[in-house]
């Protein structure tokens, strides 16, 4: 049996849409299947890797690095995006290409990113993981560190940084995939929200649906513990 | 309101050692991404720039004069100072010191500048 | 080093005229960057990035250019315009300026 619940939520362009949350019932009436998962069932993604899942993270991984900041011209925000998602005429899409990226680091002028940009997050901004010496950031941006600590300013000059950010990862379903939405949208989803996150490659979201101990390497399932939990 | 102004001796002899500092105010230089740059100028000519150091200590020259040139900080004393050894007339110029700011740049530029400093090389 | 060569050296210009200031550099670059100055004067950004106008600055100023052709338009000379600009490139180490181009009042 499915339970379904709709509702008007915000979503990713600012605007309120009819949502639908589909939530598989438990036939025996008890606890939702992320339930019975956080409890741990015997659930094989949380014991060993899947393939089916592997293949979804890397496809939304290769997605990711494609994508840029898309920030609104009316100044109410920015979101990341894939450029096709990303209005021509109401928006300004923030990517990188060529010669317009910033140069790897301060030591390297000539090579210039191509990878980004990421709304809300900068390598030439964030203190901390500072990009510089033996630990700048790739040019890829789904091997960026979250940024815990940002250059004190108010004000960047940089489009993608100095927008309201509406959007961050959201771990959504059973199957860890994450989504790039408002904090509004991923708690109707009953997803988890990584508020400390910009892209979904700084998330494991596998990790969050499984609970428990967390994995020794977030990208590698190990509780075959499970065998004996349930 | 950011300022820097640049002191040092308006004179000095061939063969001696020039030492210029730059004091500032309005910025610290251990704020994340701040620099603070050398530039000069010889009577009627252009611009060339000398050396700069960044907020983590990381320094940079112009490699043609790069054996000459040191480029120091005092954080606490919101200063920076140039040393330039075996000073020629050639070197006769103004020097200035500029931050560096990359406010909305891919790069950096040099945003504020002292009123510069003239310095002869005269025997 | 890369190269800056500016034309022309030096230009006579009325007030109201438009004028254009070109910057070639010896290799490619991705970003030029512009300076005035006035006698006496330490130089002051107009433009950074090819097209960005520094704070402060008039929107008589514009920059545009890639690769190796630069330029610096004003698009209606003001009295206060008369001085001496400057090209800068921060591609590679070292920085290099061009030798200035003077502009003066005809």
């Known amino acids: 049996a499915q339970h379904v619940t709709t509702q008007l939520v915000l979503r990713n362009k600012g605007v309120y849409e009819s949502v639908k949350y589909i939530q598989q019932e438990n036939f025996w009436i008890g606890p939702s299947s992320i339930d019975l998962i956080h409890l741990g069932a015997k659930f094989s993604p949380c014991i060993r890797k899947d393939q089916q899942i592997e293949q979804l993270v890397l496809r939304e991984r290769d997605l990711e690095r494609d994508s840029g900041c898309c920030v609104q011209n009316d100044h109410s925000g920015c979101i990341q995006t894939q450029r096709k998602d990303c209005s021509e005429t109401l928006a300004t899409f923030v990517k990188w290409q060529d010669d317009t990226g910033p140069p790897m680091d301060k030591s390297d002028l000539g090579q210039k990113r191509t990878s980004g940009a990421v709304c809300h997050q900068d390598p030439r901004t964030c203190e901390e993981p500072a990009s510089s010496g033996a630990h700048i950031w790739p040019d890829d941006i789904t091997k960026w560190p979250i940024c815990t600590e940002q250059a004190k300013s108010n004000r960047t000059g940089f489009l993608h940084m100095d927008c309201q950010i509406k959007g961050r990862p959201c771990c959504i379903s059973t199957k860890g995939s994450c989504e790039i939405t408002t904090r509004e949208y991923c708690e109707f989803m009953h997803g988890y929200f990584h508020e400390e996150a910009t892209l979904c490659s700084q998330v494991h979201c596998l990790d969050k649906v499984c609970g428990l101990l967390p994995f020794l390497n977030p990208e590698v399932p190990d509780q075959f513990y499970r065998l004996w939990l349930s | 309101q950011v300022t820097l102004r640049e002191s040092g001796p308006a004179l000095v002899k061939p063969t001696q050692t020039l030492t210029l500092t730059c004091t500032f105010s309005?910025?610290?230089?251990?704020?994340?991404?701040?620099?603070v740059g050398w530039i000069r100028q010889p009577p009627g000519k252009a611009l060339e720039w000398l050396a700069h150091?960044?907020?983590?200590?990381?320094?940079y020259y112009n490699s043609a004069l790069k054996s000459r040139l040191t480029i120091s900080k005092d954080t606490s004393k919101n200063q920076v100072v140039l040393t330039i050894t075996n000073m020629d007339p050639v070197d006769t110029a103004t020097y200035y010191c500029?931050?560096?700011?990359?406010?909305?740049?891919?790069?950096?530029?040099?945003?504020?500048w002292g009123q510069g400093t003239l310095v002869t090389v005269s025997s | 080093a890369i190269q800056l060569t500016q034309s022309p050296s030096s230009l006579s210009a009325s007030v109201g005229d438009r004028v254009t200031i070109t910057c070639r550099a010896s290799?490619?670059?991705?970003?030029m960057f512009w300076y005035q100055q006035k006698p006496g004067k330490a130089p002051k950004v107009l433009i950074y990035?090819?097209?960005n106008l520094a704070s402060g600055v008039p929107s008589r100023f514009s920059g545009s250019g890639s690769g190796t052709d630069y330029t610096l338009t004003i698009s209606s000379l003001q009295p206060e315009d008369f001085a001496t600009y400057y090209c800068?490139?921060?591609?590679?180490?070292?920085?290099?300026f061009g030798q200035g181009t003077k502009l003066e009042i005809k």
């Open positions: 800068q490139q921060w591609n590679s180490y070292p920085l290099t």
């Open positions: 309005g910025f610290s230089l251990s704020t994340f991404g701040r620099g």
């Open positions: 150091i960044w907020w983590d200590d990381e320094k």
């Open positions: 500029a931050r560096i700011q990359n406010y909305g740049s891919n790069y950096w530029y040099f945003d504020v």
């Open positions: 990035d090819t097209s």
């Open positions: 290799s490619r670059i991705s970003y």
